[in-house]
């Protein structure tokens, strides 16, 4: 029950998550232009990912899509790229969850290969989350470094009665929205990877067999000794057979760093 | 078509008040800014108010702010400016005006003249 | 405040000449979000409230005649009658939209001979 309930919220956590990584990837106030001392200004600018606006005190907003590729900044390019990443990823993985959920059936599937698909989506969602958190970051930084460089440059033309002011450009509300929803998106796929051990079963269980030896009866029960021999009926060496398919142990027990390259 | 009508101006003791209307038509009142002009005697034209368009922001110039205040009623379809403490300096013709592209202003109202003198 | 400068004050021209006047701004009215100009200039007639002639700078208001023309970046900016009418005997303002308060120039008056 405990399990199906972690599963089942990690779901939804991430699904809130990656739509709050697909409205951020898609909002227009990444960066909003910086009011410091005048809260009140007649044109205030905003830029996306996509796109740079001009919102006026006329009511009048007007938008520019970036129609160049190969003129804007690296960075933003690398900023669009993990945001697009963390989407794809988040719905692959979404999709993958729907199918691992233990209250949907689906023809016969074994609570092993769940299991399994529990652990995908939840790597998935987990990287997902840490590629929007990443481009939200590498593009606050970007925010920053530029603030202060036009706050050094502010006041450019002081040489005679002319003032230029230079637009500075602050956080805008997509960058919280981000942040949240790769928050999120990662809980949801550590969710998913805790549900994931819950619903590997704890051990293969194999009906006694009797072995028949002087006149007594002594039930042996493979794989008893598991536990303090390391022996049983899952070995470690069936890795090399099965093209490096993870067993249900490997799976529940052994989640290292290299089961989620 | 839009149409800007400017009523309640006229004649005002110095420290007074007056409250000016401006009923508007043919346009989606509360998207557009709304800006209240005043042209002084000597021909010198001033903006002493204006309200944003969406999220209705206020701006008053220095001479006026503490004195003046813009509102709109989307109900009505009216913009107000209440003035008060009333200076010798305040005498002129009021013009209500939209705003679009640039925040420039192309549709004004014919202006409603304020007096204010002992 | 921007402070906006007009010259000259006033202009006496002939019918059929060209026409300049000037506006001068004391800061940049260049927005780098869009990389326009919010300066507007207009025409008032004796007797009428001001009439939109030009908007960002050199975007002429529909209905206006093609011989008025609007150039000029940052914060020189310049309004052109390439051949001044009869009609054109007006107060010609330019205004600051790109910072509160909006502020407009004293004006030039265009007289006709």
């Known amino acids: 029950m405990a399990v199906t309930a972690c599963q089942g919220l990690g779901f939804v956590v991430s699904l809130i998550g990656i739509a709050g990584i697909i409205a951020a990837t898609c909002m227009d106030q990444w960066s909003t232009q910086d009011l410091y001392n005048n809260p009140v200004t007649a044109v205030f600018n905003y830029q996306g990912l996509w796109r740079s606006c001009v919102r006026e005190s006329s009511g009048f907003t007007e938008c520019r899509g970036y129609f160049t590729l190969l003129g804007l900044p690296a960075m933003l390019q690398a900023v669009r790229a993990l945001m697009i990443v963390g989407i794809v990823l988040g719905a692959i993985g979404l999709l993958v969850s729907i199918f691992a959920l233990k209250c949907i059936r689906i023809g016969s599937m074994e609570d092993s290969a769940k299991a399994n698909m529990t652990l995908t989506s939840g790597i998935m969602f987990i990287v997902s989350g840490l590629c929007a958190i990443a481009g939200v970051s590498v593009f606050a930084n970007m925010l920053v470094t530029n603030f202060w460089m036009s706050t050094a440059n502010m006041y450019t033309g002081m040489g005679g009665m002319v003032q230029t002011v230079q637009t500075r450009y602050t956080f805008g509300a997509a960058l919280f929205v981000g942040w949240v929803a790769g928050g999120l998106t990662l809980i949801g796929g550590v969710m998913m990877c805790i549900a994931c051990r819950g619903l590997a079963p704890e051990e293969t269980n194999y009906k006694a067999v009797s072995y028949h030896a002087s006149g007594h009866s002594v039930a042996y029960k493979p794989g008893g000794f598991k536990a303090s021999t390391g022996f049983g009926s899952n070995t470690k060496n069936k890795k090399i057979y099965d093209g490096g398919a993870r067993t249900e142990d490997e799976v529940q027990s052994y989640p290292s760093k290299h089961d989620y390259v | 078509e839009v149409k800007l009508v400017e009523s309640g101006g006229g004649l005002v003791k110095p420290g007074g008040s007056l409250k000016l209307s401006c009923a508007a038509s043919?346009?989606?009142?509360?998207?557009?800014?709304m800006s209240w002009v005043r042209q002084t005697p000597e021909k010198r034209l001033e903006c002493v108010a204006t309200i944003s368009g969406g999220d209705s922001y206020t701006y008053y110039p220095d001479s006026v702010r503490g004195r003046f205040t813009i509102s709109r009623d989307i109900a009505k379809n009216n913009l107000y400016l209440q003035m008060s403490s009333l200076r010798s300096e305040d005498t002129a013709l009021y013009y209500c005006?939209?705003?679009?592209?640039?925040?420039?202003?192309?549709?004004w109202g014919q202006g409603t003249l304020v007096t204010v003198s002992s | 405040d921007i402070v906006m400068t007009q010259s000259p004050s006033s202009l006496t021209v002939t019918a059929g000449e060209k026409v300049t006047m000037s506006c001068k701004s004391s800061q940049s009215l260049l927005n780098s979000g869009n990389q326009k100009n919010y300066l507007t200039w207009y025409q008032q007639k004796p007797g009428q409230p001001p009439k939109l002639l030009i908007y960002w700078a050199s975007t002429r208001e529909s209905g206006v005649p093609d011989r008025f023309t609007g150039s000029g970046s940052g914060i020189d900016f310049t309004l052109t009658i390439s051949s001044v009418q009869a009609e054109d005997l007006a107060f010609y303002y330019c205004q600051n939209t790109y910072s509160f308060p909006l502020t407009f120039g004293a004006g030039t008056r265009l007289d006709l001979k």
């Open positions: 005006a939209r705003s679009y592209n640039g925040n420039s202003l192309p549709y």
């Open positions: 043919g346009f989606t009142f509360s998207s557009y800014g």
